[in-house]
Interface confidence: low
């Protein structure tokens, strides 16, 4: 996961929407108790914005200490600030908790930019606007960090919702959601609706604004329109999925689909941008530039370094193309596509010098670690992390930003052959050979 701010090919047979209709798997299937319906107490329990992350209120310790915690599907540690830091309004004070248990083990987590380190322990944890349960969970008490906490973000810790395989220091450290499911009757599933504002928020507006919802243990029908379409979780480490085709304004990028998933494709709420492998990024930018060629933008804009501004209310959304990612479906040879608008991939930012203008950063960037479907993608959709069935669902979010001409979309099915070949197999070190 990265904050503001996350490593021989065959020619593809496919991805073309041939028009053949296949039976689809959506949410129109037998209901299970607790999995579907209304979760009023959890709706609107997130705050924040895509550039600084979305956070949920949690309590740790006895008596409970309230903290705001970044929701991160791209990591697997529950880690909270546990020492004074200039960017933290509050922090976890272990000495004040009668239920804290020290594991006497350190943890060090480096990111591409930044790092944190801390001390492992367990304590009682609950989510006030979540299921009415308390669990004993692993907590990394962050004692030192560098470029991790964000000034003004209003969160004091991170909730890693991915799988144990990527937990630090190793996969023996049970992630929070695993503990929650093991210790309670909460179903093994959560869903996220991240609501981009569509305009820059100042500090007071962030504190007052609704950022979205994390529904723990179920799906709330009020948060999406249309149908949910599911893609398999390829491997339980990150939330890894397979992209089988990419289109810019309906034009196929025509790349070997392995390139789209080199070396993986993940869904990561803790990353701001849509991050694409180098070759894919270059092809996508070339295509987006061509589509929006009625206006010229500096190179720094396409690199995500420079803002572009328009007079308030005059952003020419129509000159920017829609982007479609086709994801492997649950049925053999079936895919579906998710389509985002420039309202998702142009991120509104405050420009103090021109506060009467609407300014944006290009929120698609280059990655050396595969495709990362970050907040700018997720803000278009209601995303269901159905861990029990090893799949991720997408539906059009009821809160996504759009205009009168275009809307984000989730559509299918499409016939796509040989989708398994789109997955990249990361070379595994054969550890047994190292033992000899």
């Amino acid at each position: 996961t990265q904050h503001g701010i996350r490593l021989p090919l065959r020619s593809g047979l496919g991805g073309a929407p041939l028009g053949l209709r296949l039976p689809r798997e959506t949410d129109e299937e037998p209901e299970e108790p607790g999995r579907r319906g209304s979760f009023v107490e959890m709706v609107d329990n997130l705050r924040g914005k895509s550039g600084q992350g979305y956070y949920v209120e949690m309590t740790v310790g006895s008596p409970p200490q309230t903290l705001n915690i970044l929701v991160d599907t791209g990591s697997s540690n529950f880690a909270v600030g546990a020492a004074p830091h200039p960017f933290l309004h509050r922090y976890y004070q272990r000495q004040l908790s009668s239920t804290y248990r020290d594991l006497r083990k350190g943890v060090y987590v480096p990111y591409t930019q930044g790092k944190w380190e801390g001390e492992l322990g367990t304590d009682l944890v609950s989510i006030p606007h979540g299921p009415n349960v308390t669990v004993r969970a692993n907590i990394a008490a962050i004692t030192e960090s560098d470029k991790f906490f964000i000034n003004g973000s209003n969160w004091e810790g991170i909730l890693g919702l991915a799988y144990a395989e990527i937990a630090r220091p190793d996969d023996s450290l049970e992630p929070f959601f695993d503990s929650l499911v093991k210790q309670t009757h909460v179903p093994n599933l959560f869903s996220l609706q991240l609501c981009g504002a569509g305009f820059p928020l100042n500090q007071s507006e962030v504190l007052a604004s609704v950022g979205g919802s994390m529904i723990i243990g179920g799906i709330d029908h009020s948060l999406y329109t249309g149908s949910l379409w599911y893609t398999p979780i390829r491997r339980e480490w990150y939330y890894e999925v397979i992209i089988v085709r990419v289109e810019i304004n309906g034009q196929d990028l025509k790349m070997d689909c392995k390139e789209y998933n080199y070396d993986k494709s993940i869904v990561d709420s803790g990353t701001t941008n849509l991050r694409l492998p180098k070759k894919v990024f270059e092809a996508a930018v070339k295509s987006i530039k061509a589509a929006s060629s009625t206006e010229k933008f500096p190179d720094g804009f396409w690199l995500g370094e420079q803002l572009v501004c328009w007079q308030a209310g005059t952003t020419p959304w129509n000159i920017f193309p829609v982007i479609s990612l086709y994801l492997m479906g649950e049925v053999t040879n079936q895919s579906f596509r998710i389509t985002i608008l420039p309202q998702q991939y142009l991120r509104p930012v405050e420009d103090v010098a021109t506060s009467q203008d609407d300014c944006y950063k290009f929120a698609i960037s280059q990655s050396s670690t595969g495709t990362v479907m970050g907040a700018v993608i997720m803000e278009g959709f209601y995303v269901v992390f159905d861990r029990a069935r090893k799949r991720i669902g997408f539906a059009v979010s009821a809160c996504h930003v759009h205009d009168e001409f275009r809307t984000a979309a989730v559509e299918g099915p499409f016939v796509t052959l040989d989708m398994e070949d789109c997955g990249y197999n990361i070379p595994q070190t054969d550890e047994s050979t190292l033992m000899t």
Epitope: H85, P86, Y108, P110, E117, E144, S145, D146, K147, N151
Partner: antibody, heavy 119, light 107 residues
Framework: EVQLQQSGADLMKPGASVKLSCKAT????????IEWVKQRPGHGLEWIGE????????NYNEKFKGKATFTADTSSNTAYMQLSSLTTEDSAIYYC????????????WGQGTTLTVSS | DIVLSQSHKFMSTSVGDRVSITCKAS??????VAWYQQKPGQSPKALIY???NRHTGVPDRFTGSGSGTDFTLTISNVQSEDLAEYFC?????????FGGGTRLEIK
């Protein structure tokens, strides 16, 4: 008390290499970065780079890549900077400094090593 | 690289006065700025980090302020021992860079 003790002054010939040392005491050596800074009269302070002894992670100023190499010996709590292919431009005072992992500023400095390169 | 400009190479003040030393960054560095004091023949000493936080043991007459591109180190009630050169540093992005220094002279 945090202390960074640097090696003594050196007089070197152009083309030679030199290894400067910085011994840390009074804190956990592996929990902080060691910064290296160059100071020449009229040139102010220049950041050369840093090493994190806990993981031997390094960051170099592009300008000094190929010129400076950082190492650290955690058994003796000593950081080293090797300067290669010396020229008169390398004549300066070199400082090591400690930097907290969570702030990046140089909170404690060594006394400096004066390097003179002359034929 | 980010350039830090300290517009005054020298500043002259009297004991008991208040003096402000400025530092301007060529681009936004947030609050990732530190100030150092270097007395003649000595190594630099940390005064301020994160633009406004005093380093341990630094007298409260030293105050840092600013964010983005404009930063100020203010010394109120200047003492004779404050005769030194003062440097700003940004650590928002690599390579970290320093200002050219401002030498404070006591009248």
């Amino acid at each position: 008390e945090v202390q960074l003790q640097q090696s003594g002054a050196d007089l070197m010939k152009p083309g030679a290499s030199v290894k400067l040392s910085c011994k840390a005491t009074g804190y956990t050596f592996t929990g902080y970065w060691i910064e290296w800074v160059k100071q020449r009269p009229g040139h102010g302070l220049e950041w050369i780079g840093e090493i994190f002894p806990g993981s031997v992670s390094t960051n170099y100023n592009e300008k000094f890549k190929g010129k400076a190499t950082f190492t650290a010996d955690t058994s003796s709590n000593t950081a080293y900077m090797q300067l290669s292919s010396l020229t008169t431009e390398d004549s300066a005072i070199y400082y090591c400094a400690r930097s907290p992992i969570y702030y990046d500023y140089a909170d404690y400095w060594g006394q400096g090593t004066t390097l003179t390169v002359s034929s | 690289d980010i350039v830090l400009s300290q517009s005054h190479k020298f500043m002259s003040t009297s004991v008991g006065d208040r003096v402000s030393i400025t530092c301007k960054a060529s681009q936004d560095v947030g609050t990732a700025v530190a100030w150092y004091q270097q007395k003649p023949g000595q190594s630099p000493k940390a005064l301020i980090y994160l633009a406004s936080n005093r380093h341990t043991g630094v007298p409260d007459r030293f105050t840092g302020s600013g964010s983005g591109t404009d930063f100020t180190l203010t010394i109120s009630n200047v003492q004779s021992e404050d005769l030194a050169e003062y440097f700003c540093q940004q650590y928002n992005s690599y390579p970290y860079t320093f200002g050219g220094g401002t030498r404070l002279e006591i009248k």
